[in-house]
Interface confidence: low
C-alpha cells in the first residue's frame, strides 16, 4: 500500500513538475526590464527564450521572435537545449511511469518489470529536473553578470560619446517557475526510485506452519530463504531460526579483520 502511494505521489509530483518546465520554457518573462533610469519611460521590455516583447503604458504589446539563431548568445542556445532535453526526458519518463504504476494492470506484466520501469522513469525524472534547474540557473547567472556589466557601463562612452542610459534586466517569473518545477520533477523522480525498491515480486502469504521435529522446535515459512530480487529491504526474507542459516541480506560482506589481510 505504501509503495503504491509513494509511486502514485511520485508520478503526480513529476507530472506537475514537467508541466511547470514546459510552462517556464514557453513563458516570455525570463528576464524583465529593470526600470531604473530609463528615459523612454513608457516602454517595458521582457524577454523569453524564444522572443522579446515590448509593453507600453498605452497597453500596446508586441512580441517578436529572435530572427537569427547565429546572432543569439551561445549560452541562450545552451539554456534552450537544456530545457528541451528536460521536457523530452520528462515526457518519456511520464509515458514509462504510466505503464509502471502498480494500480494499473496491463496484461500479465510482472512486478519485476514494473519495478524496472519505475526505476527507469524515476531516473528520467531526476535528470529532467536537473536539466531544468541547470538551464534556469545558467540563465539567471547570465542575467546577474549582464546586470552588473550594464550597471558599470551605464555612464561609460563608446567612441567618445557618453551613453547616458543602459537598460538592465532582472529575474522574470519564468525563472522561479522553472526552479520550482525542476525541484518538483527531481523530488518526483526520487519518490519513484524509492517506490521501485518496494516493488519486488510479492510472495503468496501462507500462514507459517510449525513442525515438531525431535530435539528441535523450528518454525518454517515457505519462501523464507528465497533469493533477494535486489530491489531493496528484504522484509519478507527474515531469519526464522537461529540455526546459523542466513538470508542473502544478512550475509552481505561487512568489513572484517580478514578484509585487510
Amino acid at each position: 500500500m505504501a509503495v503504491t502511494a509513494c509511486q502514485g505521489l511520485g508520478f503526480v509530483v513529476s507530472l506537475i513538475g514537467i508541466a511547470g518546465i514546459i510552462a517556464a520554457t514557453c513563458m516570455d518573462q525570463w528576464s524583465t526590464q529593470d526600470l531604473y533610469n530609463n528615459p523612454v519611460t513608457a516602454v517595458f521590455n521582457y524577454q523569453g527564450l524564444w522572443r522579446s516583447c515590448v509593453r507600453e503604458s498605452s497597453g500596446f504589446t508586441e512580441c517578436r521572435g529572435y530572427f537569427t539563431l547565429l546572432g543569439l548568445p551561445a549560452m541562450l542556445q545552451a539554456v534552450r537545449a537544456l530545457m528541451i532535453v528536460g521536457i523530452v526526458l520528462g515526457a518519456i519518463g511520464l509515458l514509462v511511469s504510466i505503464f509502471a504504476l502498480k494500480c494499473i494492470r496491463i496484461g500479465s506484466m510482472e512486478d519485476s518489470a514494473k519495478a524496472n520501469m519505475t526505476l527507469t522513469s524515476g531516473i528520467m525524472f531526476i535528470v529532467s529536473g536537473l536539466c531544468a534547474i541547470a538551464g534556469v540557473s545558467v540563465f539567471a547567472n547570465m542575467l546577474v553578470t549582464n546586470f552588473w556589466m550594464s550597471t558599470a557601463n551605464m555612464y561609460t562612452g563608446m567612441g567618445g560619446m557618453v551613453q547616458t542610459v543602459q537598460t538592465r534586466y532582472t529575474f522574470g517569473a519564468a525563472l522561479f517557475v522553472g526552479w520550482v518545477a525542476g525541484g518538483l520533477t527531481l523530488i518526483g523522480g526520487v519518490m519513484m526510485c524509492i517506490a521501485c525498491r518496494g516493488l519486488a515480486p510479492e510472495e503468496t502469504n501462507y500462514k507459517a506452519v510449525s513442525y515438531h521435529a525431535s530435539g528441535h522446535s523450528v518454525a518454517y515459512k515457505p519462501g523464507g530463504f528465497k533469493a533477494s530480487t535486489g530491489f531493496g529491504s528484504n522484509t519478507k526474507n527474515k531469519k526464522i531460526y537461529d540455526g546459523g542459516a542466513r538470508t542473502e541480506d544478512e550475509v552481505q560482506s561487512y568489513p572484517s579483520k580478514h578484509d585487510y589481510v
Epitope: V40, V54, S57, S58, R64, F67
Partner: nanobody
C-alpha cells in the same frame, strides 16, 4: 546592422522652426527611437523618445515646443522643433533601440546633425 542617417539641421533664428529626420535602414524595425542632443561641453541628454506603439516622452525643457513623430512604414523618425531658443543649439543625435535576446537592447546612433539657433 542598423544605420541611422539624420538630416534637416542647420542655422535658424530664435523663434524659428526646423524639422529633423532620421532614416533607419537595415536589420529590423526599432522598438524605441529617440532624439538626443549634446551641447558643447555638456553631457548628452534625451530630447524626445517614441516607442513602436506610439507612446512619447519629452524632456521638460522642450515640452510644448517640440513634437516627435514616427513613420513605421518608412522606418523614419521626425522631430518638429518650433519656437527655437539659443539654448537649443547642439548636435542632435538619432537613437534606435532594438530589443533582442542579448539581455539589454542594442543601441544604435546616428552621426548627428548640427542645429544652431542664432540671430
Amino acid at each position: 546592422q542598423v544605420q541611422l542617417v539624420e538630416s534637416g539641421g542647420g542655422l535658424v533664428q530664435p523663434g524659428g522652426s526646423l524639422r529633423l529626420s532620421c532614416a533607419a535602414s537595415g536589420e529590423i524595425s526599432s522598438d524605441a527611437m529617440a532624439w538626443y542632443r549634446q551641447a558643447p561641453g555638456k553631457q548628452r541628454e534625451l530630447v524626445a523618445g517614441m516607442t513602436r506603439g506610439g507612446s512619447t516622452n519629452y524632456a521638460d525643457s522642450v515640452k510644448g515646443r517640440f513634437t516627435i513623430s514616427r513613420d513605421n512604414s518608412k522606418n523614419t523618425l521626425y522631430l518638429q522643433m518650433n519656437s527655437l531658443r539659443a539654448e537649443d543649439t547642439a548636435v542632435y543625435y538619432c537613437n534606435a533601440e532594438i530589443y533582442t535576446g542579448t539581455f539589454y537592447p542594442r543601441s544604435y546612433w546616428g552621426q548627428g546633425t548640427l542645429v544652431t539657433v542664432s540671430s
